[in-house]
Interface confidence: low
């Protein structure tokens, strides 16, 4: 349905306060580096103008399409050529080229300060003072560091950020009651701004049909009640949403965000029996409550799949006539029987089957062909179940933090030329899958774990992609992306490293070590760790350990010691000098 | 809404005939193909018979083979089964899926085969 104004539309739509909150944030996400009191000088700029469009949708520009209206208000923004530099000539494009361009620009990793939380005090005061304000800027701070962020969610966020402001403000003990919620939300801000990346690294690298089938799998799963055209209705609704988001276009995306939490609480008899609690609550919370929503049971009487995707004579018949359709049912058919696979594992077997067929439906003797095409998955269901169950065995041997030590270990050697803070960032977040899912019943580790992995290991893409420095994770990255974890899992030391040369400069440590907390002071040590095995690659497990068990006694000696900085001066060399007879 | 809604069950003399509908609504009803499935009491299901988007191709299970006919029309929205010969052994709740599927979707019409 088309309207004479998109602005307006969209504005009596969603309503003030969450269309100026939407645009906000794609502001912030455009251009990452500007003062927040600029992109708040914008908003309330278009806010006005979209004012003008819903009184009278007949009023000069009000015709123009979104990109062209936010695209032109970007542009005004006079320190664009020194700030962004070659991003400024993305002005000179026309649309809907200029979005395209805007889009290229979003960093993954923009070159912003770590968020420092104030004292509690100050921010109970800074909220208290003016609130609208304070939340604007937790927009805004998140979404220029996180350019892919589910902007409708990021809402849903923000509401809770207020809410527990308001909350533990007035209260007793006022950070008892904020910093928890604050970590809470802080921890789970960053898993959701990494599953949405992997979606939108999906639908821009991979196209939407992967995207789609990504979809039919895991809404197969979460709903295997719901017959296969409704599963493909959602597949579709859902697919345009997150390539709206994903392509900057956030009032649409929310918009039809909203719509179809709508349509599934209407339909909930067709969809699942556990949509019932997350349709009463608000707009937010209920379409957050949707995306999360536990797996319904499964129909009790589902018959065996060979019947149709094996015994059938007419498998290549069915096949030919509606390829996409006729996979489409076979994946649906079976992750609907399977929340016990991972998502990538249920895409891989389809990708299997559709192989198979396309082999066999060109041979003398299909059905002959096909036949076993169900023991060839076996293979491709123990390789991520065995890898789920050794790892799941080390972390429970080792614990968090020396099991991330060991991928630490694994990857360095797998892939050395990765920058060292890149790689301990992603082994640190491949680590934390122990404690997220290995606790989990076995029917449901693999696919925590698995699709978990996908999630981290799309970070180190999008990193790699901005500056490549391994061909090895470039293939891997670029070839399949069902096939991404199983391909980093393959890889082996990479023997046509150079090892690095040692430099006593990044082994030398000073008494500021003793004042960080708990996790800095884990990824100083794992910095170094990093170093090592680029330095000596072939270094074996039990040398490294020996290396980082001295560095630990040597760190806790200089922080008991009355002259910090005098036993770090004087003991630091000594450990440098044992750690490389140790390694030679 | 997805729905799938079966009519033109009985109760009906052996050797007898009666003509099953499917209407359905809520999905592109001329880009699927569509299945027949029965399930007699105490039994799991059973599929009868499958006809392709376009009409042009159908499919039927051995036991009903010459005895049944699937049709259906896709400006209408509606799938057809059109019962002749029919047998006590036809006794069942008789039911339309999308596609090949033989998961239940929809209530059913109860066919009875006595005399």
């Known amino acids: 349905d088309t309207h004479k104004s998109e602005v307006a539309h969209r504005f009596k739509d969603l309503g003030e306060e969450h269309f100026k909150g939407l645009v906000l944030v794609a502001f912030s996400q455009y251009l990452q580096q500007c003062p927040f009191e600029e992109h708040v000088k914008l908003v309330n700029e278009v806010t006005e103008f979209a004012k003008t469009c819903v009184a009278d949708e007949s009023a000069e520009n009000c015709d123009k399409s979104l990109h062209t209206l936010f695209g032109d208000k970007l542009c005004t923004v006079a320190t664009l050529r020194e700030t962004y530099g070659e991003m400024a000539d993305c002005c000179a494009k026309q649309e809907p080229e200029r979005n395209e361009c805007f889009l290229q620009h979003k960093d993954d990793n923009p070159n912003l300060p770590p968020l420092v939380r104030p004292e509690v005090d100050v921010m109970c005061t800074a909220f208290h003072d003016n609130e609208a304000t304070f939340l604007k800027k937790y927009l805004y701070e998140v979404a220029r560091r996180h350019p892919y962020f589910y902007a409708p969610e990021l809402l849903f966020f923000a509401a809770r950020y207020k809410a527990a402001f308001a909350e533990c403000c007035q209260a007793a003990d006022k950070a008892a009651c904020l910093l928890p919620k604050l970590d809470e939300l802080r921890d789970e801000g960053k898993a959701s701004s990494a599953k949405q990346r992997l979606k939108c690294a999906s639908l821009q690298k991979f196209g939407d049909r992967a995207f789609k089938a990504w979809a039919v799998a895991r809404l197969s799963q979460k709903f295997p009640k719901a017959e296969f055209a409704e599963v493909s209705k959602l597949v579709t609704d859902l697919t345009k949403v997150h390539t709206e988001c994903c392509h900057g276009d956030l009032l649409e995306c929310a918009d039809d965000r909203a719509d179809l939490a709508k349509y599934m609480c209407e339909n909930q008899d067709s969809i699942s029996s556990k949509l019932k609690e997350c349709c009463d609550k608000p707009l937010l919370e209920k379409s957050h409550c949707l995306a999360e929503v536990e797996n319904d049971e499964m129909p009790a009487d589902l018959p065996s799949l060979a019947a149709d995707y094996v015994e059938s004579k007419d498998v290549c018949k069915n096949y030919a006539e509606a390829k996409d359709v006729f996979l489409g049912m076979f994946l649906y058919e079976y992750a609907r029987r399977h929340p016990d696979y991972s998502v990538m594992l249920l895409l891989r077997l389809a990708k299997a089957y559709e192989a198979t067929l396309e082999k066999c439906c060109a041979a003398a003797d299909p059905h002959e062909c096909y036949a076993k095409v169900f023991d060839e998955f076996q293979p491709l269901v123990e390789e991520p179940q065995n890898l789920v169950k050794q790892n799941c065995e080390l972390f429970e041997q080792l614990g968090e933090y020396k099991f991330q030590n060991a991928l630490l270990v694994r990857y360095t050697k797998k892939v050395p030329q990765v920058s060292t803070p890149t790689l301990v960032e992603v082994s640190r977040n491949l680590g934390k899958v122990g404690a997220k899912c290995c606790k989990l019943p076995e029917a449901k580790r693999m696919p925590c774990a698995e699709d978990y992995l996908s999630v981290v290991l799309n970070r180190l893409c999008v990193l790699h992609e901005k500056t490549p420095v391994s061909e090895k994770v470039t293939k891997c990255c670029t070839e399949s992306l069902v096939n991404r974890r199983p391909c980093f899992s393959a890889l082996e030391l990479d023997e046509a490293y150079v090892p690095k040369a040692f430099n006593a400069e990044t082994f030398t440590f000073h008494a500021d070590m003793c004042t960080l907390s708990e996790k800095e002071k884990q990824v100083k040590k794992q910095t170094a760790l990093v170093e090592l095995v680029k330095h000596k690659p072939k270094a074996t497990k039990e040398q490294l350990k020996g290396v980082m068990d001295n560095f630990a006694a040597f760190v806790e000696k200089c922080c008991k010691a009355d002259d910090k900085e005098a036993c770090f001066a004087e003991e630091g060399p000594k450990f440098v000098a044992a750690s490389q007879a140790a390694l030679a | 809404q997805v729905q799938l809604v079966e009519s033109g069950g009985g109760l009906v003399q052996p050797g007898g005939s009666l003509r099953l509908s499917c209407a359905a609504s809520?999905?592109?009803?001329?880009?699927?193909?569509m299945s027949w499935v029965r399930q007699a009491p105490g039994k799991g299901p059973e599929w009868v018979s499958a006809?392709?988007?376009?009409?042009?191709?159908?499919r039927y299970a051995e036991s009903i083979k010459g005895r049944f006919t699937i049709s259906r029309d896709n400006a209408k929205k509606t799938l057809y089964l059109q019962m002749n010969s029919l047998k006590p052994e036809d006794t069942a709740v008789y039911y339309c899926?999308?596609?090949?599927?033989?998961?239940?979707g929809s209530q059913g019409t109860q066919v009875t085969v006595s005399s």
């Open positions: 006809i392709d988007s376009g009409g042009t191709d159908t």
């Open positions: 809520g999905f592109t009803f001329g880009s699927f193909g």
């Open positions: 899926t999308i596609g090949q599927s033989t998961s239940r």
